[in-house]
Interface confidence: medium
């Protein structure tokens, strides 16, 4: 297992609809064709996997159907979007990138993006 640098923004504020987007950028040492991206959440010293996707370079990320995550890739950048967040979901969201193929296997873990989620005060007669 070889180490790889992963960069992500320090702080992101989710939208009033509970959607947070951030870029996860990795310094690919070689020409990877298969990449796995995992989003982890750290809160109260507990780390939980939020979602994960494996993609072939040049193709779309495919998260599980109905996942709270979506994403697109461009070169060594992955644009991640997490939706349906509430204030209780505020925490440090860590991007983990694995270069799966071809060998050698590389692993990189970002320092995390602190996502702040504020529950909007429901406005009278607002839409979803």
């Amino acid at each position: 297992c070889k180490a790889m640098h992963v960069a992500q923004p320090a702080v992101v504020l989710a939208s009033s609809r509970g959607i947070a987007s951030f870029v996860c950028e990795y310094a690919s040492p070689g020409k990877a064709t298969e990449v796995r991206v995992t989003v982890l959440r750290q809160a109260d010293s507990q780390v939980t996997e939020v979602c994960a996707a494996t993609y072939m370079m040049g193709n779309e990320l495919t998260f599980l159907d109905d996942s709270i995550c979506t994403g697109t890739s461009s070169g060594n950048q992955v644009n991640l979007t997490i939706q349906g967040l509430r204030a209780m979901d505020t925490g440090l969201y860590i991007c983990k990138v694995e270069l799966m193929y071809p060998p050698p296997y590389y692993l990189g873990i970002g320092n995390g993006t602190q996502i702040y989620v504020i529950d909007p005060e429901p406005c009278p007669d607002s839409d979803f």
């Epitope: 809160a43 109905d66 979506t70 209780m88 005060e121 009278p124 839409d127």
Partner: antibody
């Protein structure tokens, strides 16, 4: 199809704790918030709290703060509700209920409920 | 904390009649965050209406919801025998505030 299956009825003594489970199937477990709602005999519905199975975060009704703990096990698609320091007033049917989600937007209503677990607190 | 008050407590009507159930909030509620449920004895509640007026999947069109601000109404245009049950309204205020009304019992006259 979506199914929520809860654990069986419990009889507890005052001061004890109870842990009720709710196993989900038929959908992506981590994509929908889960709630616990209780109903005392002949009474109305009372919201207890919410858990996000994806990240394990929780939020509880003020009334139950410090007495309730909600957890989940993603490997078995199960959520748990533990209520401690039980008293006779906690005798109720406890429901787990899934929150509606449309196009990724969470909508704060409950579309699927289990039939509930009766917890009786009696000395 | 927003309190929801339902009226009447009990409504006695005959099949074929029109039922009008009221839910009043102690302060203004977003209509997007108001729902109605039906509960029959020994069963879990069933979502009927959400967003004050949108019917949930599989709910017959005899059920309709309306209202805004502090006053909301559930209307059943022509009562069927299976409609006799307890009805609850529910609102959302934030992550820690999901509240229900005390319920209206709809019984056969």
């Amino acid at each position: 199809q979506v199914q929520l299956v809860q654990s069986g009825a419990e009889v507890k003594k005052p001061g004890a704790s109870v842990k009720v489970s709710c196993k989900a199937s038929g959908y992506t477990f981590t994509s929908y918030y889960m709630h616990w709602v209780r109903q005392a005999p002949g009474q109305g519905l009372e919201w207890m709290g919410i858990i996000n199975p994806s990240v394990g975060s929780t939020s509880y009704a003020q009334k139950f703060q410090g007495r309730v703990t909600m957890t989940r096990d993603t490997s078995t698609s199960t959520v748990y509700m533990e209520l401690s320091s039980l008293r006779s007033e906690d005798t109720a049917v406890y429901y787990c209920a899934r929150e509606v989600r449309v196009r990724g937007v969470i909508i704060p209503f409950f579309d699927y409920w289990d039939q509930g677990t009766l917890v009786t607190v009696s000395s | 904390e927003i309190v929801l008050t339902q009226s009447p407590g009990t409504l006695s009507l005959s099949p074929g009649e029109r039922a009008t159930l009221s839910c009043r909030a102690s302060q203004s509620v977003s209509s997007s965050y108001l729902a109605w449920y039906q509960q029959k004895p020994g069963q879990a509640p069933r979502l009927l209406i959400y967003g004050a007026s949108s019917r949930a999947t599989g709910i017959p069109d005899r059920f309709s919801g309306s209202g805004s601000g502090t006053d909301f109404t559930l209307t059943i245009s022509r009562l069927e025998p299976e409609d006799f049950a307890v009805y609850y309204c529910q609102q959302y205020g934030s992550s820690t505030m999901y509240t229900f009304g005390q319920g209206t019992k709809l019984e056969i006259k």
